[in-house]
Amino acid sequence: TQNKALPENVKYGIVLDAGSSHTSLYIYKWPAEKENDTGVVHQVEECRVKGPGISKFVQKVNEIGIYLTDCMERAREVIPRSQHQETPVYLGATAGMRLLRMESEELADRVLDVVERSLSNYPFDFQGARIITGQEEGAYGWITINYLLGKFSQKTRWFSIVPYETNNQETFGALDLGGASTQVTFVPQNQTIESPDNALQFRLYGKDYNVYTHSFLCYGKDQALWQKLAKDIQVASNEILRDPCFHPGYKKVVNVSDLYKTPCTKRFEMTLPFQQFEIQGIGNYQQCHQSILELFNTSYCPYSQCAFNGIFLPPLQGDFGAFSAFYFVMKFLNLTSEKVSQEKVTEMMKKFCAQPWEEIKTSYAGVKEKYLSEYCFSGTYILSLLLQGYHFTADSWEHIHFIGKIQGSDAGWTLGYMLNLTNMIPAEQPLSTPLSHSTYV
């Protein structure tokens, strides 16, 4: 008789990342008997939900169920039926919902309640939806990349799992750029973290980590663009805004009501003598860079050193993984290679921004114009944020690694979030037998 293969003893978990611009569903899988080991969880699926972020459904909450259907049905297909009832589902909402909550707690609660109602009606073990803090977002991103890079493992490996991996236990810093916020998280070198709000203490796999983190709300790429437009329209002499961050020949009409809809532009709000204005691109990197720098207040710092807006930032230390929009934008611009210096990146951006809009549209015919039009701004913003905001230099630039995936799993906060909520990161180094669940972070 033939030997029947035993059914594999695996577990699954689902995390939905409800970002400001869109929602993505991630499915993770791991061997059931190895859940305390480091590096065993891997992503088996990513499903991008069609449509905007959940905060945009505030006036149409009844459409949330339909919005989530395709990706939740995909999860039903990918995960074996026998596992559905045991598969935890988590939804974490980030800065888009933080901003909505700032405007109206009641509206944010309504959106989350309806999201929960939709997700509760699937045959998984739904654990609830919540708005995660910026500190959590930074911390979980840091946990994700270091977990995937094997930095928490005590076993030194003879092989390298990623091209830029140094075979030591020094953790990577995490740089995360979203649409509405950006996070910087790393272990500083023997440096006191001067502001308690930015300090995290972890004990993971038997080792203590003192981690610095900060999330800059309104400094994600989309909200930074709204900020820049709101700042620049203040000094425009009429309803034409000649904008160096858009390609020459590019034109777009913006409603003033849309500009002032977000809490991020409140500080620039003023009564304008027009309801609409037209952006006219002039495509000049240097001027764009200068305009972006005006969003960073570097004149005030109550600490030994700051990033911007009076926020403490210790001296940068070690290698950094830059992911999410840091990666997507730089990948589009073909600037993710380890060999590309900061000077070369700047040169490429100068050339790219100066290219006429008609030429850009022809060269990238398959890309949606809304996204295509914003790469000059986004690329320039990334450089400004990393160099002037976080104080990377031409020399330390080589320590930034633009990462999309590690070992097939997306870099981002979702894996770290799930590892924590499912108690899969033990405080102590696991013995050969699994530990009790009492010592988890």
Epitope: R117, L119, S120, N121, P123, F126
Partner: antibody
């Protein structure tokens, strides 16, 4: 263990009002939603309203103008206010807990409270 | 509103029988259907959700099937304690609606 206990039923005249209460134990109203469902004598079940964990509400449009659902988390109590009562509102009124966080099917029901509308 | 129709109001059965109770939705409800059991003088008890997932503690003689508009609750080996009313419920859209119920009786 999970329990829901309804009260507030009784005999009421047409056109009158009533406030039903549902006291819950074994779970918290900040973690689960609660629905109200009614069952007329010898009839099927009819869904009335839900209040979700953050306080959002939804109603059966057929009753919307005559119903109000609310809750007091500190008292572990959900309320259903019924106005302009009619003879055909005579029924057993149940509160029921969402089986999952905010789902629309129910794993625990109260024993029901009887409302009789009679002139 | 979505109408849930349980065409058989009563069904006569014997202990040991295989019993199938059907429920038809007036429009597509996917698999967003639950089944409840209600004994006289008691409140309903959840048996099945998502059309075919057995709720914890429910004996495995109860199975649910179907999707779209046609749904079935099957009791594979009828027991005397299963004599009760059975209701289907759709939760695909508001208002939530229930079938009229099917009462199982002994032949």
């Amino acid at each position: 263990q999970v329990q829901l206990v309804e009260s507030g039923g009784g005999v009421v005249q047409p056109g009158g009002s009533l406030r039903l209460s549902c006291v819950v134990s074994g779970f918290t109203l900040t973690n689960y939603g609660v629905h109200w469902v009614r069952q007329a004598p010898g009839k099927g079940l009819e869904w009335l309203a839900v209040i979700l964990r953050r306080g959002s509400t939804d109603y059966n449009a057929a009753f919307m103008s005559r119903l109000a659902i609310s809750k007091d988390n500190s008292k572990n109590t959900v309320y259903l206010e019924l106005n302009s009562l009619r003879l055909d509102d005579t029924a057993v009124y149940y509160c029921a807990k969402t089986a999952v966080v905010a789902g629309d099917y129910f794993d625990y029901w109260g024993q029901g409270t009887t409302v009789t509308v009679s002139s | 509103d979505i109408v849930m129709t349980q065409s058989q109001k009563f069904m006569s059965t014997s202990v040991g029988d295989r019993v199938s109770i059907t429920c038809k939705a007036s429009q597509n409800v996917g698999t967003n259907v639950a089944w409840y059991q209600q004994k006289p003088g008691q409140s309903p008890k959840l048996l099945i959700y998502s059309a075919s997932y057995r709720y914890s503690g429910v004996p495995d003689r109860f199975t649910g099937s179907g999707s779209g508009t046609d749904f079935t609750l099957t009791i594979s080996n009828m027991q005397s304690e299963d004599l009760a009313d059975y209701f289907c419920q759709q939760y695909n859209s508001y208002p939530l609606t229930f079938g009229g119920g099917t009462k199982l009786e002994i032949k």
